[in-house]
């Protein structure tokens, strides 16, 4: 999977839309890397 | 309202340095990554590299290793991109950008720094 | 590096039509495509990401499509303000790269 930042960022958007937002307040596109998904 | 706030342009002689700043607002400066991107007549847009508010951690296109540092300023939320041993080849526009989730997912960019080298 | 084409340089057209603008990949790139619109004087504006995603803001005459190496941008029912470059750029590797642009022009 891809793994730039930009690639990162969008993902981790993606994921917060389907959650609803509800995920925890440090999981931003610089605390996470592409592992995390 | 999300805004990157650029320095004014510059006129500065070859073989000198300058320093670009990207002042941001409107969003948790240290949550999203920042790009840098050139664009001149010669090669439309150049990504340069970004840089990662939170740690500092950098990714620079191997052509503008050498030339281009990028920085941050936690404190004033801002960014920063020196560029090193200027020639005219290094005349043009170059921008900040972000792409931001929080308030508004969209990618932000700044309205551009004119950089002209010329003796 | 990889490099995005895009082979039409100028395009021309009417107010109300239909225009397709093309860039392709010099290899595989998945859905990592993003497309910019840059009026005259002006910064690039983000319109798609993941090939086909638009923001929000972006009008619905704005369509992105393609995958893999292949990649369109459609505009419908052209207005005279759609007058601008557009570019493409990959972000599925480093460095991310840009297509040279595409002018279109409203007769």
């Known amino acids: 999977a891809c793994d730039t930042a930009t690639c990162v960022t969008h993902r981790l958007a993606g994921l917060l839309s389907r959650s609803g937002g509800v995920v925890k307040n440090n999981f931003v596109p610089t605390n996470v890397g592409s592992k995390a998904f | 309202e999300v805004q990157l706030q650029q320095s004014g342009p510059e006129l500065v002689k070859p073989g000198a340095s300058v320093r670009i700043s990207c002042k941001a607002s409107?969003?948790?400066?240290?949550?999203?990554?920042m790009n840098w991107v050139r664009q001149s007549h010669r090669k439309s847009l150049e990504w340069i590299g970004d840089?990662?508010?939170?740690?500092?951690?950098?990714n620079y296109n191997q052509k503008f290793k050498g030339k281009a540092t990028l920085t941050v300023d936690k404190s004033s939320s801002t960014a920063y991109m020196e560029l090193r041993s200027l020639t005219s080849e290094d005349s043009a526009v170059y921008y900040c950008?972000?792409?931001?989730?929080?308030?508004?997912?969209?990618?932000?960019w700044g309205q551009g720094t004119t950089l002209t080298v010329s003796s | 590096d990889i490099v995005m084409t895009q082979s039409q340089k100028f395009m021309s057209t009417s107010v109300g039509d239909r225009v397709s603008v093309t860039c392709k990949a010099s290899?595989?790139?998945?859905?990592?495509v993003a497309w910019f619109q840059q009026r005259p004087g002006q910064s690039p504006k983000a319109l798609i990401y993941?090939?086909?995603y638009r923001y929000s803001g972006v009008p619905d005459r704005f369509t992105g499509s393609g995958s893999g190496t292949d990649f369109t941008l459609t505009i419908s029912n052209v207005q005279s303000e759609d007058l601008a470059d557009y570019f493409c750029?990959?972000?599925?590797?480093?460095?991310?790269?840009f297509g040279g642009g595409t002018k279109l022009e409203i007769e």
């Open positions: 409107g969003y948790t400066f240290t949550d999203y990554y």
């Open positions: 750029q990959q972000y599925n590797n480093y460095p991310y790269t």
């Open positions: 290899q595989n790139v998945d859905t990592n």
């Open positions: 840089i990662n508010p939170n740690n500092g951690g950098t």
């Open positions: 950008a972000s792409i931001i989730i929080v308030p508004n997912y969209f990618d932000y």
């Open positions: 993941s090939a086909s």
